[in-house]
């Protein structure tokens, strides 16, 4: 079977302050099993935005119904965007393990924040 790919179709997204940003991500396979996580930025200082496995992320909702067993759409919506949210967001597939290990990352989506229209 073909190896899993993580697809972030949008190189960039621009959103007005106060609006919601939708960041798209799909995977091409459910194997290997393991959670999806979203990060802002790359490297050791990257910020966790959403973890499929656990955690409380009040501003983040999944766009599709993530509890579907065959779900391959891990797009998220981030509400009430502010200029502090600007950055590049990465959708990352982890492979199960102790601990889970990063398996494949999407290419990233750069979020820019426009001034709130007056």
């Amino acid at each position: 079977e073909e190896e899993l790919q993580v697809i972030q179709p949008d190189k960039s997204v621009s959103v007005a302050a106060g609006e919601s940003a939708i960041l798209h991500c799909t995977v091409t396979s459910l194997i290997p099993v393991g959670p999806i996580q979203w990060f802002r930025g790359a490297g050791p200082a990257r910020e966790l935005i959403y973890n499929q496995k656990e955690g409380h992320f009040p501003r983040v909702t999944t766009v599709s119904e993530s509890t579907k067993r065959e779900n391959m759409d891990f797009s998220i919506s981030i509400s009430n965007i502010t200029p502090a949210d600007a950055g590049t967001y990465y959708c990352v597939k982890f492979r199960k393990g102790s601990p889970d290990t990063e398996f494949k990352s999407g290419a990233g989506t750069e979020l820019s924040v426009r001034a709130k229209p007056s």
Epitope: I31, K53, T67, R69, K96
Partner: antibody, heavy 118, light 107 residues
Framework: DVQLVESGGGVVRPGESLRLSCAAS????????MSWVRQAPGKGLEWLAG????????YYIDSVKGRFTISRDNSKSSLYLRMNSLTAEDTAVYYC???????????WGLGTLVTVSS | ALTQPASVSANPGETVKITCSGG??????YAWYQQKSPGSAPVTVI????ERPSDIPSRFSGSASGSAATLIITGVRVEDEAVYFC???????????FGAGTTLTVL
Amino acid sequence: DVQLVESGGGVVRPGESLRLSCAASGFTFSSHAMSWVRQAPGKGLEWLAGISAGGSDTYYIDSVKGRFTISRDNSKSSLYLRMNSLTAEDTAVYYCARETWNHLFDYWGLGTLVTVSS
Amino acid sequence: ALTQPASVSANPGETVKITCSGGDYYSTYYAWYQQKSPGSAPVTVIHSDDERPSDIPSRFSGSASGSAATLIITGVRVEDEAVYFCGGYDGRTYINTFGAGTTLTVL
């Protein structure tokens, strides 16, 4: 505290139908996929059916497909299992279970006994 | 199908290991369910291979490697006597399966 309480079991004759209910409390029911699992007398556990959090997607073991129907009413925090054309082999304790993010089970109900006998 | 031993016995304080085989490591997540008497509600002691619910004692742990999962009870107690079912979820088939159960006797 998470609570799952099944009801609707009882004694029925072969060929008859029954609808089991599971009342959920102590968590956001509409955020979790749910399943039904049964245990025949002196036997092990057998997964029967699962349903996504929104109720749009259902999954069944082959042996009950077309005969059993899983459904849910999120406004009532309730899960259901409609069982048609019952046979003696369906005699079991029926449990509802809450699914984890990866479709295992973290909480179980106390079960309801279904006896199919002429 | 998942395969586990029919029975295991141990003295109080010993470490017990129960194995479960038959799943593909890359597509299967494992869990362990404790049932203290037939027909009573199962209790999840481990899910997601190695995650322990907050209300389960720390003497219960789990691991998975290759095609097998292991439940470890470190310092087993008399109250741990039960049947332990391994369960699996297969991401290829979308199906949940269970082993036949292992009866743990604490001597």
